[in-house]
Amino acid sequence: LSSEAPITGEGQATGIREMDGELTAAPTPEQSDRGVHFVTTAPTLKLLNHHPLLEEFLQEGLEGREEAPRPALPFQPDSPTPFTPSPLPRLTNQDNRPVFTSPTPAVAAAPTQPHSRKKPWNPESEPPELYITSPLPPGPSMAVPTLHPEDRPSTTPPSQAWTPTQEGPGDMGRPWVPEIMSKTTGLGIEGTIATSTASGDDEETTTTTIITTVTTIQPPGPCSWNFSGPEGSLDSPAVPSVPSDVGLDCLYYISVYPGYGVEIKVKNISLQEGETITVEGLGGPDPLPLANQSFLLRGQVIRSPTHQAAVRFQSLPLPAGPGTFHFHYQAYLLSCHFPRRPAYGDVTVTSLHPGGSARFHCATGYQLKGARFLTCLNATQPFWDSQEPVCIAACGGVIRNATTGRIVSPGFPGNYSNNLTCHWLLEAPESQRLHLHFEKVSLAEDDDRLIIRNGNNVEAPPVYDSYEVEYLPIEGLLSSGRHFFVEFSTDSSGAAAGMALRYEAFQQGHCYEPFVKYGNFSSSAPSYPVGTTVEFSCDPGYTLEQGSIIIECVDLRDPQWNETEPACRAVCSGEITDSAGVVLSPNWPEPYGRGQDCIWGVHVEEDKRIMLDIRVLRIGSGDVLTFYDGDDLTARVLGQYSGPRGHFKLFTSMADVTIQFQSDPGTSALGYQQGFVIHFFEVPRNDTCPELPEIPNGWKNPSQPELVHGTVVTYQCYPGYQVVGSSILMCQWDLSWSEDLPSCQRVTSCHDPGDVEHSRRLISSLKFPVGATVQYICDQGFVLTGSAILTCHDRQAGSPKWSDRAPKCLLEQFKPCHGLSAPENGARSPEKRLHPAGATIHFSCAPGYVLKGQASIKCVPGHPSHWSDPPPICRAASLDGFYNGRSLDVAKAPATSSALDAAHHHHHHHHHH
């Protein structure tokens, strides 16, 4: 309610502050680490539902710009008009920088040199050069000539003939030309084919015409084509006239306008054994694997959540020639993820596409913290302009003009915290009184306390004190005046759910608004004057108990309801004949009791069946929930369950199901919370599996429209989400799905960045959540290159990512030692000016001279490197010394292991972390 003003924060509320409006916090947009500024020369695509923000750029795109364009393939062979780049819209990014910058010639990091022949194309490192071109001025529909195998002339062209779409690491001469089709849109825009630039040994050739001749057959190498229109067709390479002994490696590179994704539909596919097709989404921080040949069945639709995609076809040399396929792609408008629903609140979305908005509101008793409205902004990956808000229960507050509403303790329905003192002042409108319903009061059995005072301050007389009263008054409380003063205090130990109170103001001569927990009511008059009748009903799964279904406001002098309001309770057992409904464990959402034996019968029309959607199942290991496929306990058991279990579904083969629940008489069920929630639906009896729902933050791709036996449905998640459960569900022979429905869960952590050789790492948390850090420190003798500290960052449009890649610890490089001169009357080996760290030099003396000192000395690695010993000298030997063989031609050093061979050298002052 807008009149509710909370006291912010928890802890001691020293007084009551009155506030206007709601407590809100300035939104903090999530910062994106997408540093890439997308560059394109493409026109705005005029597609359905396109954001109006882009419209103003369309006309501009059709006016020429004085820039020398790179030649592109014309739509008509005799067309004299070259394509010109079109200007770009400036769209807001998370950090308020433009997402799309001014045009520059290339779209996708085009290398300056043409690709080499040998290097395989790697979409992660360098996509092929791609030029997206503007359309011609509007005119009649035009189509790209399609090259068919039968159209090929028999003449042999010069040795450097090129297919117009040849790009990347392709072989110099291609033995056949692929079929390339591009469908015309309403604007006359074609999926244009990029210019080819190929480099021979000495020259560079640029071609802008379709070559319909073929070269003398050469072994086919890798092949690639670019597609840049809003839609087009991808076809397998045509069969060569002579079988090749070299396989194929073909790449189809698709790029549509940023802000759009690429949707690829499999029209036809027939591959030979050993052939592979992979589909990847490009244009994001990392290539995104989307599908491979095992999933690419006819009718399958693959969606890349980025504006670029690549299809790679690899074939071994096959006697029968390569397999065939025919795919169709089209651009589709990307959308923001579905905003997170706040706990104790809700969200309504006008559209997930750019320009759409999400409106948040909180359940009664909770205040919204954050932005009430979010807008989806256009970008390469659209994003919300602010973080989703949260709904919080405030500790105290003043509620002026209180009509109907609710106050809840902080943390409700979870536990409250310790050492709280919360005061609420409820003030009804002038000349009205208040009624309080006790929705829930659950206090820890210690010094936690709830006092309700009949007045507007702490001195007013109490009408309810949890210290004094064991049971809650069913009829609630009435104020004698305009005010109630509510005090809620907790001590330093223990906690429980706290309290939820519902208040209603009523005028003189009227009754207060009734309330039924887990139910609803209809009234014959809106303000409940004397004579009003109210009829109660319960929420699905609940039954009316204690009290009457219909009550009346009576007594003109002191209006009051003639009977107490009824209660809605989840009861043990029942017979249900509705086409849809709910079965709840006894006393839900409170814990069920021990020693219960409950039976529910659910019956639908004879020619129908029942789907049981078990949404919550949290029972003890000694408790049993059994489903019987029929109308009594002798029927076939559909399933029997004990202990907690995740969401699952069951399908009956009959029009009746019997549900039995037996709780263990010996143990307390309290440890298992609630119990179970079973939704049931009447479903048609037919030869298809039941329709599968869409999942939040993801989409589904059925292999065919009818969900007949054998149909495969693949679920995929939007960027930043991952599939939890099985992503592939198959319609089984019994017309049930092979797996439970998966969900798309927000990826909240980074992958383990791994250990780095010759280092140790310090981690701030084990599972690498957003904000976690990993610090690498090299072992001694090694130098760190890269970032020593990595931080896991959240990203609006994708999974969390490390701030950098893991570093490397490289062996320290040492400077060489300067050469020593040979001793007088001696020699050194080797004779060099510089000696690398770890090297050894050997000294020898001329005949008649004796070596004094070390015969071999070593260049010891260090900063600086230094010789292990001083150089020796050669002294003249005495005659008897000479004849005794004490002077050697070459003095041999004792064998020592080279420090360089085995040691990892390092000095600690030269580390860079």
């Epitope: 010759h758 310090l762 701030s764 850090t773 072992d779 001694q780 040691a903 990892h904 390092h906 580390h911």
Partner: antibody, heavy 120, light 106 residues
Framework: EVQLQQSGPEVMKPGASVKMSCKAS????????MHWVKQNQGKSLEWIGE????????GYNQKFKGKATLTVHKSSSTAYMELRSLTSEDSAVYYC?????????????WGQGTLVTVSA | QIVLTQSPAIMSASPGEKVTMTCSAS?????MHWYQQKSGTSPKRWIY???KLPSGVPARFSGSGSGTSYSLTISSMEAEDAATYYC?????????FGAGTKLELK
């Protein structure tokens, strides 16, 4: 002057946990990692692990993973080590230590040690 | 992990005598560090990066070696040098220490 002041001796029962402290002074606590070293009665030294007080990152000797937990309290410039599930094998002197510079690999500054005795 | 073996485990020397103790590594290491520890006190950094002496360590101490073989030498033993000496490497994580050489005064 760099000083590392460790908490006093502890006598513990098997199965219990012990938490010792190491208060640093004479330098900026968050600028250097804090290391912990065990010296048992046989006098050999073993590196347990280290913590970066700035980011809270920890690294452990595989042998002490699950046995030791390192934490810091930045505002008081104090490092802590908790040892759990104590056995007689854990009876030893435990030192906190700091390297000379951020990029050095030898322990230049040592605490006076905390003697832990585990006995039934 | 790299194992450091110190020898001898115990040795004694007279004042003025030259003393050499060794530390052998199970794999090649780039540097060796040495610590002196006297009974009831914490270890002290005595030699670092194979051959460097921190301030306060007498010049009669020296260190040398490379690869898997390192040594600490006292050119002329003095009474105050009686202690246990430990070698330590960190060329591979985890850092490891030798079992120590106890030097006694004869």
């Amino acid at each position: 002057e760099v000083q590392l002041q460790q908490s006093g001796p502890e006598v513990m029962k098997p199965g219990a946990s012990v938490k010792m402290s190491c208060k640093a002074s004479g330098y900026t606590f968050t600028d250097y990692n804090m290391h912990w070293v065990k010296q048992n009665q046989g006098k050999s030294l073993e590196w347990i692990g280290e913590i970066n007080p700035n980011i809270g990152g920890t690294g452990y000797n595989q042998k002490f993973k699950g046995k030791a937990t390192l934490t810091v309290h930045k505002s008081s410039s104090t490092a802590y080590m908790e040892l759990r599930s104590l056995t007689s094998e854990d009876s030893a002197v435990y030192y906190c230590a700091r390297t000379y510079s951020y990029y050095s690999y030898e322990f230049a500054y040592w605490g006076q040690g905390t003697l832990v005795t585990v006995s039934a | 992990q790299i194992v450091l073996t110190q020898s001898p485990a115990i040795m004694s020397a007279s004042p003025g005598e030259k003393v050499t103790m060794t530390c052998s590594a199970s794999s090649s290491v780039s540097y060796m560090h040495w610590y002196q520890q006297k009974s009831g006190t914490s270890p002290k950094r005595w030699i670092y990066d194979t051959s460097k002496l921190p301030s306060g360590v007498p010049a009669r101490f020296s260190g040398s070696g490379s690869g898997t073989s390192y040594s600490l030498t006292i050119s002329s033993m003095e009474a105050e040098d009686a202690a246990t000496y430990y070698c330590q490497q960190w060329s591979s994580t985890p850092p490891t220490f030798g079992a120590g050489t106890k030097l006694e005064l004869k």
